[in-house]
């Protein structure tokens, strides 16, 4: 399977909400002992490999934000911890998964990574990730709503191993 990032850049005004999205593509094993671990974290551009560094999002680690389920099953973060930080991660039946960040501030600007791990009976079989940038703007140059910029076809199917 692959992970696609429909948008590579999100430009948002301060105070707005944004939903960053990744999509799981390709055949998904729905075996009894196969599950998927999906999560989000921040990273930085200045590395050899994008997304290799895992930094928290608003003090929440990728473990705090994870979703875990079988196949193309729907799931969302049920714990209060994420919601208290204005965050919610979710996954639908079609392979889309997302993180919603509420009440954006300038400190939220940066590179965000989604990670999908296929787990076959507690063993990591396959890892893929996608990357996108969030720019939070303030002042007269800031847009009134979030503006999203589609990934190039090459970027949108990011299959770099995490």
């Amino acid at each position: 399977f692959k992970v696609a990032t429909p948008y590579s850049l999100y430009v948002c005004p301060e105070g707005q909400n944004v939903t960053l999205t990744c999509r799981l593509l390709g055949p998904v094993d729905k075996g009894h002992d196969v599950t998927f671990y999906k999560t989000w974290y921040r990273s930085s551009r200045g590395e050899v490999q994008t997304c290799s560094e895992r930094r928290p999002i608003r003090n929440l680690t990728f473990q705090d934000l994870h979703l875990h389920h079988g196949g193309h099953q729907a799931a969302n973060t049920s714990h209060d911890l994420a919601q208290r930080h204005g965050l919610e991660s979710a996954s639908d039946h079609h392979g889309n998964f997302s993180i919603t960040m509420r009440n954006l501030t300038l400190l939220d600007s940066g590179l965000y990574c989604c990670l999908v791990v296929e787990i076959r009976h507690h063993h990591s079989e396959h890892r893929v990730h996608g990357a996108m940038e969030l720019q939070v703007q303030t002042g007269k140059d800031a847009p009134s709503n979030c503006v999203v910029y589609p990934s190039s076809s090459q970027d949108s199917e990011n299959i770099t191993a995490a």
């Epitope: 009894h32 002992d33 599950t35 671990y37 979703l67 875990h68 389920h69 079988g70 099953q73 799931a75 049920s78 714990h79 787990i119 009976h121 507690h122 063993h123 990591s124």
Partner: antibody, heavy 115, light 106 residues
């Protein structure tokens, strides 16, 4: 906050039966594999059984015929039915959640098999 | 069923670095996980998937795996690290624990 709370332990005579329960909260119970792990007094950890998110069960080969794991996703509860209990089954029984390793553990419930 | 072998005991002084090994003939590509059990408490996941620290675990704890052996390293040893440490892996569909290592902080 993830919480696992075991109950049902106690004193039972050899040959007797006991059913342990584990009430789960703070996460989507039906999406996770769950296991029972036990620890005899002063000894190490021993895996007992697992039930996957889809209901597939696996057992420690030495215990399979006597122990049965089950789950009720509507009640967010994991169970362990233990039959034909022996003195060597005396242990603290822990309920655990599993992704790769066992990332959350209950506080355990003590099962004592003695006449 | 495979067996994970750990040394029964280890020790170190505060500030020191201590390593605990876990060996298995057939460890292959399977992930190894590490747990800490403080006296009188339930075990706690420290390291999963060979080298990933569990949430909230300080970076003094690290895991590695090479060939037939996995290791847990604790740097800057503290008195509160005195505990039993267990490695664990999955052998097909069966979970296996090491016998445990009792770490004493001198």
């Amino acid at each position: 906050e993830v919480q696992l709370l075991e109950s049902g332990g106690g004193l039972v005579q050899p040959g007797g039966s006991l059913r342990l329960s584990c009430a789960a909260s703070g996460f989507t119970f039906s999406n996770y594999a769950m296991s029972w792990v036990r620890q005899a007094p002063g000894k190490g950890l021993e895996w007992v059984s697992e039930i996957s998110h889809s209901g597939t069960t696996n057992y420690n080969p030495s215990l399979k015929s006597r122990f049965t794991i089950s789950r009720d996703n509507s009640k967010n509860t994991l169970y362990l039915q233990m039959n034909s209990l022996r003195a060597e089954d005396t242990a603290v029984y822990y309920c655990t959640r599993a992704i790769w390793g066992f990332d959350y553990w209950g506080q355990g419930t003590l099962v004592t098999v003695s006449s | 069923q495979s067996v994970l072998t750990q040394p029964p005991s280890a020790s170190g002084t505060p500030g020191q670095r201590v390593t605990i090994s876990c060996s298995r003939e057939n460890i292959g590509s399977r992930s190894v996980h590490w747990y800490q059990q403080l006296p009188g408490t339930a075990p706690k996941l420290l390291i999963y998937d060979n080298n990933e620290r569990a949430s909230g675990v300080p970076n003094r704890f690290s895991g590695s795996k090479s060939g037939t052996s996995a290791s847990l390293a604790i740097s800057g040893l503290r008195s509160e690290d005195e505990a039993d440490y267990y490695c664990q892996a999955w052998d097909s569909s069966t979970a296996v624990f090491g016998g445990g290592t009792k770490l004493t902080v001198l």
